[in-house]
């Protein structure tokens, strides 16, 4: 049994780190493998993560962790029974992938404006809470040529779009993702998308 692609891990800077790797051949990850992890810290103990399959040769493990601080460093050992397949380390603060924003809602009852709101995925006491900026992707299933990214660089998780900039009488979808500039993170996954129908019509005298 061999590791083809070494584990690569990212932290959500809250309570979960996700490690993914590829094996040399088809593997029943949960039955054959264990990822052991331990914080480099006085009197810490070893904890075990049972991986799941992620495609034929891919495995993924969700490591339960404490709140992340910059000093934290973990040792990682990938075992197949009594055989040590790989040994490494992981510093969560240096490999952050934020959680995806949630509760994306479209408000169309605001005059002349489409208002999109979503929730910050972190509690106020988390360091990432006040550092997130967002990208909102809006596209149309009726008009495949239409896809826009709106960068939200302010803290408030809202975006206002003049309804007149969208075509009337067709449906649109939106999704949002986040990143934290000062923590040099990657982008989060996209939130689930939300659909709405743009029924806005310009006043007669403006047509």
């Amino acid at each position: 049994m061999k590791v083809l692609q070494e584990p690569a891990c990212v932290s959500d800077y809250m309570s979960i780190s996700t490690c993914e790797w590829k094996m040399g051949g088809p593997t029943n990850c949960s039955a054959e493998l264990r990822l052991l992890y331990q914080l480099v810290f006085q009197s810490s103990e070893t904890h075990t993560c049972v991986p799941e399959n992620n495609g034929g040769v891919g495995c993924v493990c969700h490591l339960l962790m404490d709140d992340v601080v910059s000093m934290d460093n973990y040792t990682l050992d990938l075992w197949a029974g009594q055989q040590l397949l790989w040994k490494g380390s992981f510093k969560p603060s240096e490999h952050v992938k934020p959680r995806a924003p949630g509760n994306l809602t479209v408000h169309t009852n605001v005059s002349d404006t489409v208002l999109l709101t979503w929730s910050n995925p972190y509690p106020p006491d988390n360091y990432l809470y006040n550092d997130l900026t967002y990208a909102v992707n809006i596209w149309s299933e009726n008009d495949p040529a239409y896809s826009r990214i709106h960068n939200v660089t302010y803290l408030k998780p809202t975006l206002r779009i003049p309804a007149s900039t969208l075509k009337s009488g067709i449906s649109y979808r939106a999704r949002v993702r986040a990143w934290a500039q000062h923590y040099n993170t990657t982008w989060s996954e996209w939130s689930p998308s939300t659909k709405w129908y743009n029924s806005y019509r310009e006043p007669f005298e403006q047509r």
Epitope: L39, Q42, H47
Partner: antibody, heavy 125, light 112 residues
Framework: EVQLVESGGGLEQPGGSLRLSCAGS????????MTWVRQAPGKGLEWVSS????????YYADSVKGRFTISRDNSKNTLYLQMNSLRAEDTAVYYC??????????????????WGQGTTVTVSS | DIVMTQSPLSLPVTPGEPASISCRSS???????????VDWYLQKSGQSPQLLIY???KRASGVPDRFSGSGSGTDFTLKISRVEAEDVGFYYC?????????FGQGTKLEIK
């Protein structure tokens, strides 16, 4: 009531051995790291050794490394310190103390918040 | 190893007056914001040490509020707002960031 009771001290000749015990009660013993601290006559406190809650990690002062062994039996709620190749400078009162909660991912520290009454070890010919 | 240096080593105090003991570490004991791994212990004559303050400023259970800890990084202070006769004994700071744990030399507090 959370309590630690040491035993096993006594008079031993240089080069001899002693095994100290520390019985814990009133708390979930296996969840906590444990520590031994000693105090030579008229001197200050000196850390000797520590062990994680599951016994997988042990730590020693340079002055006792290779001679002392810390261990625990969680089924008996008891901590041990096996002392071999004893020297005159090991003469001290030995205290066991309850250390950090080590079963969490990052051990939670609340200080050495419970201490035993101490057991006296005298090494002399 | 981290060296802990206490001062003063002897502290005569009048009852009702405040007292202050300083402890300096040879390297930072700050692991993360608000978590300085330094404790303060009191050892009264013929007794086992007892915990007063942990993580720099957190008062242990049952410790009177006249005891307080402060400081961050390498400089720490134990303050007693109004010394009482029962406070006499040796006070030790200890770093618990990692092994080997190290203690200060001890400060003997006595009543004038």
């Amino acid at each position: 009531e959370v309590q630690l009771v040491e035993s096993g001290g006594g008079l031993e000749q240089p080069g001899g051995s002693l095994r100290l015990s520390c019985a814990g009660s009133g708390f979930t013993f296996r969840d906590f790291a444990m520590t031994w601290v000693r105090q030579a006559p008229g001197k200050g406190l000196e850390w000797v050794s520590s062990i994680s809650g599951d016994g997988s990690n042990t730590y020693y002062a340079d002055s006792v490394k290779g001679r002392f062994t810390i261990s625990r039996d969680n089924s008996k709620n008891t901590l041990y310190l096996q002392m071999n190749s004893l020297r005159a400078e090991d003469t001290a009162v030995y205290y066991c103390a309850k250390d950090r909660l080590s079963k969490t991912i990052r051990p939670r520290y609340y200080g050495l918040d419970v201490w035993g009454q101490g057991t006296t070890v005298t090494v002399s010919s | 190893d981290i060296v802990m240096t206490q001062s003063p080593l002897s502290l005569p105090v009048t009852p009702g007056e405040p007292a202050s003991i300083s402890c300096r570490s040879s390297q930072s004991l700050l692991y993360s914001i608000g978590y300085n791994y330094v404790d303060w212990y009191l050892q009264k004559s013929g007794q086992s040490p007892q915990l007063l303050i942990y993580l720099g400023n957190k008062r242990a259970s049952g410790v009177p509020d006249r005891f307080s800890g402060s400081g961050s990084g390498t400089d720490f202070t134990l303050k007693i707002s109004r010394v009482e006769a029962e406070d006499v004994g040796f006070y030790y700071c200890m770093q618990a960031l990692g092994s080997p744990y190290t203690f200060g030399q001890g400060t003997k507090l006595e009543i004038k």
